[in-house]
């Protein structure tokens, strides 16, 4: 559910990519949300998404427990009371395991019809 009363999220960026984890950063208005709801979905599988929540005061979180060299779609929503923002999504390929931390090989965030590509 989305509402005009709920301010939307700003931007979401994958800051660090490892072989089994990554770090997600995002922007959002201060004090706007009780928590952020994040879904980590392995691309091209029917496996259930890994769901996690982050307190509303944070703008960054680690996402552990991922597979190496795997495409993931990460979706984040801000939640307050009975409302949720329009989701923002990022697509990322985890590192192959040869190095601990790689730059994101492909990061994409989209909200509605807007698409931004970072390489």
């Amino acid at each position: 559910a989305s509402t005009g009363e709920t301010p939307n999220l700003g931007e979401v960026v994958v800051a660090e990519v490892g072989w089994d984890a990554l770090k997600l950063n995002w922007t959002a208005p201060e004090g706007a949300y009780e928590y952020f709801f994040i879904q980590v979905q392995e691309a091209d599988t029917v496996e259930a998404a890994q769901n996690l929540t982050v307190p509303g005061g944070l703008r960054s979180t680690d996402l552990p427990g991922l597979k190496a060299a795997t495409h993931y779609t990460i979706t984040i929503r801000g939640v307050t009371q009975d409302f949720s923002t329009t989701p923002l999504s990022v697509e990322v390929l985890t590192a192959s395991g040869l190095n601990d931390i790689f730059e994101a090989q492909k990061i994409e965030w989209h909200e509605g019809t807007h698409h931004h590509h970072h390489h």
Partner: antibody, heavy 121, light 107 residues
Framework: QVQLVQSGAEVKKPGSSVKVSCKAS????????ISWVRQAPGQGLEWMGG????????NYAQKFQGRVTITADKSTSTAYMELSSLRSEDTAVYYC??????????????WGQGTTVTVSS | DIQMTQSPSSLSASVGDRVTITCRAS??????LGWYQQKPGKAPKRLIY???SLQSGVPSRFSGGGSGTEFTLTISSLQPEDFATYYC?????????FGQGTKVEIK
């Protein structure tokens, strides 16, 4: 003050299903996850699954996947846990809980009073 | 699912003893880890959240610590009312998981 009130004790036959309800009052319902936790006699706590009503989709522990269905009715602030293909090992106390962490960051955890489900032929 | 391995499964101790219970996660968790006390016939009661934050109203003899995959609950001076079963719960990554429990009995 949040209260979680569960439905009453049930006695079921093996192979049947049971549906336990958990009505929340005294706080926002939709954006806070409700979990289901069970405890067999003399055994430990087992997290079965949880749901955030605003999103509708539930998460389940692997052990219960395919046999448990967790739903929520936002209009009545009630969560439900249905367990099918019951066997004697499902005899347990079933708790609903609003647990700190997963879609809840308040100062307290809240638990229902527990519902005893007995599976016996 | 993340496995939470709790040890010991039971222990005998005397009033005044210092007791430490350990929980190991099968992979790194996001430090959304709590400790619960349960007495027979009662719902669990949370003692510690976010690894080391003390629940309001819980005596300061209870403390939590650790990070990554290894976490501890310490009771600095065991009191008669502390004889109970203790569980850890990771609730940062779904599905959530409890440890198997540690029963603290009177020696």
């Amino acid at each position: 003050q949040v209260q979680l009130v569960q439905s009453g004790a049930e006695v079921k036959k093996p192979g049947s299903s049971v549906k336990v309800s958990c009505k929340a009052s005294g706080g926002t319902f939709s954006s806070y996850a409700i979990s289901w936790v069970r405890q067999a006699p003399g055994q430990g706590l087992e997290w079965m699954g949880g749901i955030i009503p605003i999103f509708g989709t539930a998460n389940y522990a692997q052990k219960f996947q395919g046999r448990v269905t967790i739903t929520a009715d936002k209009s009545t602030s009630t969560a439900y846990m249905e367990l099918s293909s019951l066997r004697s090992e499902d005899t347990a106390v079933y708790y609903c809980a609003r647990l700190y962490g997963y879609a809840y960051y308040g100062a307290f955890d809240y638990w229902g009073q527990g519902t005893t489900v007995t599976v016996s032929s | 699912d993340i496995q939470m391995t709790q040890s010991p499964s039971s222990l005998s101790a005397s009033v005044g003893d210092r007791v430490t219970i350990t929980c190991r996660a099968s992979q790194s968790i996001r430090n959304v880890l709590g400790w619960y006390q349960q007495k027979p016939g009662k719902a669990p009661k949370r003692l510690i959240y976010d690894v080391s934050s003390l629940q309001s109203g819980v005596p300061s003899r209870f403390s939590g610590g650790g990070s990554g995959t290894e976490f501890t609950l310490t009771i600095s001076s065991l009191q008669p009312e502390d004889f109970a079963t203790y569980y850890c719960l990771q609730n940062g990554l779904q599905p959530a998981t409890f440890g198997q429990g540690t029963k603290v009995e009177i020696k």
